[in-house]
Amino acid sequence: GQFRVIGPGYPIRALVGDEAELPCRISPGKNATGMEVGWYRSPFSRVVHLYRNGKDQDAEQAPEYRGRTELLKETISEGKVTLRIQNVRFSDEGGYTCFFRDHSYQEEAAMELKVEDPFYWVNPG
């Protein structure tokens, strides 16, 4: 059946060295355990994280994300997942696309990650 993919409607903000969490879900909610689910940065070959066959498929990841991502899938049976990026870098800033694909249908949603310097402080006065 068909579905929509919904990401956050606002930029996700994270500090350098911290964690960022990018949520993504399908609507109407349905079990996504058997789907191919992932995040990529354009072009598609820059894979941030890929999940299929009930497992994270680390071999497909772009080298700069290896060992730094985790898919939170406790609610994947409801069609909800979150990508956690650890040890955030300035180079992680920018656009991300989350996609869900089943055997007959694929949809995706774009989202943005803003990375900020924890040591940069502007005097409000």
Partner: antibody
């Protein structure tokens, strides 16, 4: 309508080379992994190789690793299989198959009609 | 590599019969299994994926079941068009796949 049309098969001597092509239409070619599956005369199906939608990841059966190379040209909607150091046991009908996934190997929802490769002296 | 074993190799049946084909995996593959039908001189056709999901356009007399290591393809009422060879395929391995040796369904 999805269509896959293989070409390039024929008779080749042992140790020789051949390049198979598969022209695809009716779907967004670059969004799907593609595979080659072969079937020796009177035998069952054997998966040979696969390639991700972008072409960035390739996968091979042990029986052809180091001898066969899969590639794709997404601007031409075409899949290729370069076969080197051919052996008699490579004789088969070679099918091009569309996968449902973007990466790796899943199940194949569309198949070409096949092209026959005969390796014989 | 995961080995797939089908039984029987050949099955003789009549139109209207209920037909069951079994596929066993050498290790657990969860529900990552597909079934195909192939007629002589033709390409295989996908019938079932994820062990029990019917591919679009496939008649409802075909059904699949099972998980782990044992799977079945059932044709509830065999039709003349169903005489063919059937293959199972494991899709658990992600970066490779293997097929069963095939089951030929012939006219009794």
């Amino acid at each position: 309508e999805v269509q896959l049309l293989e070409s390039g098969g024929g008779l080749v001597q042992p140790g020789g080379s051949l390049r198979l092509s598969c022209a695809a239409s009716g779907f967004t070619f670059s969004s799907y992994a593609m595979s080659w599956v072969r079937q020796a005369p009177g035998k069952g199906l054997e998966w040979v190789s696969a390639i991700s939608g972008s072409g960035g990841s390739t996968y091979y059966a042990d029986s052809v690793k180091g001898r066969f190379t899969i590639s794709r040209d997404n601007s031409k909607n075409t899949l290729y299989l370069q076969m080197n150091s051919l052996r008699a046991e490579d004789t088969a009908v070679y099918y091009c198959a569309k996968d449902w996934v973007y990466f790796g190997v899943g199940s194949f929802d569309y198949w070409g009609q096949g092209t026959l490769v005969t390796v014989s002296s | 590599d995961i080995q797939m074993t089908q039984s029987p190799s050949t099955l003789s049946a009549s139109v209207g019969d209920r037909v069951t084909i079994t596929c066993r995996a050498s290790q657990s593959i969860s529900s990552w299994l597909a079934w195909y039908q192939q007629k002589p001189g033709k390409a295989p056709k996908l019938l079932i994926y994820d062990a029990s999901s019917l591919e679009s356009g496939v008649p409802s007399r075909f059904s699949g079941s099972g998980s782990g290591t044992e799977f079945t393809l059932t044709i509830s009422s065999l039709q003349p068009d169903d005489f063919a060879t059937y293959y199972c395929q494991q899709t658990h391995s992600y970066s490779s796949t293997t097929f069963g040796q095939g089951t030929k369904v012939e006219i009794k």
